[in-house]
């Protein structure tokens, strides 16, 4: 059967600077030349798009300038980094991969990565 499976880590802890990175890997049923990667956030039953990028195989992954995501691609693996996260952004981040070209189109959706974000403690005022 020709199916597309997407794998991503179950849990990631964001850094104290609010940066979280994870790998999204997909098993491609065909030789795609154009791939779209979308990061979705699922909170309660609401799903929202965090960021998206379309790239040509062999080329670099480029998100929009104002995106909170950056990433690099290598074969069927995408290394994603989400920046500017705060405690309220803790949630399930789902990697969605679409093989856009050539036909046929294939969809792959990961099970999601639970990203935990802890806001850093404010530095106490120091008296000198």
């Amino acid at each position: 059967c020709k199916a597309m499976h997407v794998a991503q880590p179950a849990v990631v802890l964001a850094s104290s600077r609010g940066i979280a990175s994870f790998v999204c890997e997909y098993a491609s049923p065909g030789k795609a030349t154009e791939v779209r990667v979308t990061v979705l956030r699922q909170a309660d039953s609401q799903v929202t798009e965090v960021c998206a990028a379309t790239y040509m195989m062999g080329n670099e992954l480029t998100f929009l300038d104002d995106s909170i995501c950056t990433g690099t691609s290598s074969g069927n693996q995408v290394n994603l980094t989400i920046q500017g996260l705060r405690a309220m952004d803790t949630g399930l981040y789902i990697c969605k991969v679409e093989l856009m070209y050539p036909p046929p189109y294939y969809l792959g959706i990961g099970n999601g990565t639970q990203i935990y974000v802890i806001d850093p403690e404010p530095c106490p005022d120091s008296d000198f």
Partner: antibody, heavy 118, light 108 residues
Framework: QVQLVESGGGVVQPGRSLRLSCTAS????????MDWVRQAPGKGLEWVAV????????YYADSVKGRFTISGDSSKNTLYLQMNSLRAEDTAVYYC???????????WGQGTLVTVSS | EIVLTQSPGTLSLSPGERATLSCRAS???????LAWYQQKPGQAPRLLIY???SRATGIPDRFSGSGSGTDFTLTISRLEPEDFAVYYC?????????FGPGTKVDIK
């Protein structure tokens, strides 16, 4: 809230052309795949075509390939279906639908009836 | 192309009864990317279930989806008067996207 409104249906003779429009509101057009689905009188649903995101990738059902063209104008938040060389078997209610972020068509328009008859 | 077959064609039941609708695919549906829709006369379809088992926003919990591979089921645990309609399954894992022929649930 999300709304899809189709227009442009009507009665047309075989071999002629018609253009359907679907005006979308309540969401960012370029973040979703947009589809046309049709339903012949008393029959089931048939997927017709899809256009994705920036509009470069489009796919069609074999039954309409080469005759129908899907397009979109993100500045107007409008989806189109240009139907050429129409046949009697193209008679149907045509729905536009939004592809959900996690799959399935989560919002549908009310439909517009296209009748191909001499 | 994945061909979907639905059974039965018509299901005659009374309000309060349990409805079990089947959808079978000609080949395995990619990662269970299967949806169920409800359609009432003169209305557009409404998404009930996506991903074979996830309920769409606002859908009552009496609707549930299950299955994997080639065999899928939509269950309505206790039929309400407003549930009598036609139900379609659809695969969206690969193009062309295809619908089943539908199952009509009518009042016995």
């Amino acid at each position: 809230q999300v709304q899809l409104v189709e227009s442009g249906g009507g009665v047309v003779q075989p071999g002629r052309s018609l253009r359907l429009s679907c005006t979308a509101s309540g969401f960012t057009f370029s973040s979703y795949g947009m589809d046309w689905v049709r339903q012949a009188p008393g029959k089931g649903l048939e997927w017709v075509a899809v256009i994705w995101y920036d509009g470069r990738n489009k796919y069609y059902a074999d039954s309409v390939k080469g005759r129908f063209t899907i397009s979109g104008d993100s500045s107007k938040n409008t989806l189109y279906l240009q139907m050429n060389s129409l046949r009697a078997e193209d008679t149907a209610v045509y729905y536009c639908a939004r592809g959900g972020l996690l799959g399935g068509f989560d919002y549908w328009g009310q439909g517009t009836l296209v009748t191909v008859s001499s | 192309e994945i061909v979907l077959t639905q059974s039965p064609g018509t299901l005659s039941l009374s309000p309060g009864e349990r409805a079990t609708l089947s959808c079978r695919a000609s080949q395995s549906v990619s990662s269970n990317y299967l949806a169920w829709y409800q359609q009432k006369p003169g209305q557009a379809p409404r998404l009930l279930i996506y991903g074979a088992s996830s309920r769409a926003t606002g859908i009552p919990d009496r609707f549930s989806g299950s299955g994997s591979g080639t065999d899928f089921t939509l269950t309505i645990s206790r039929l309400e008067p407003e549930d009598f309609a036609v139900y379609y399954c659809q695969q969206y894992g690969s193009s062309p996207f295809t619908f089943g022929p539908g199952t009509k649930v009518d009042i016995k």
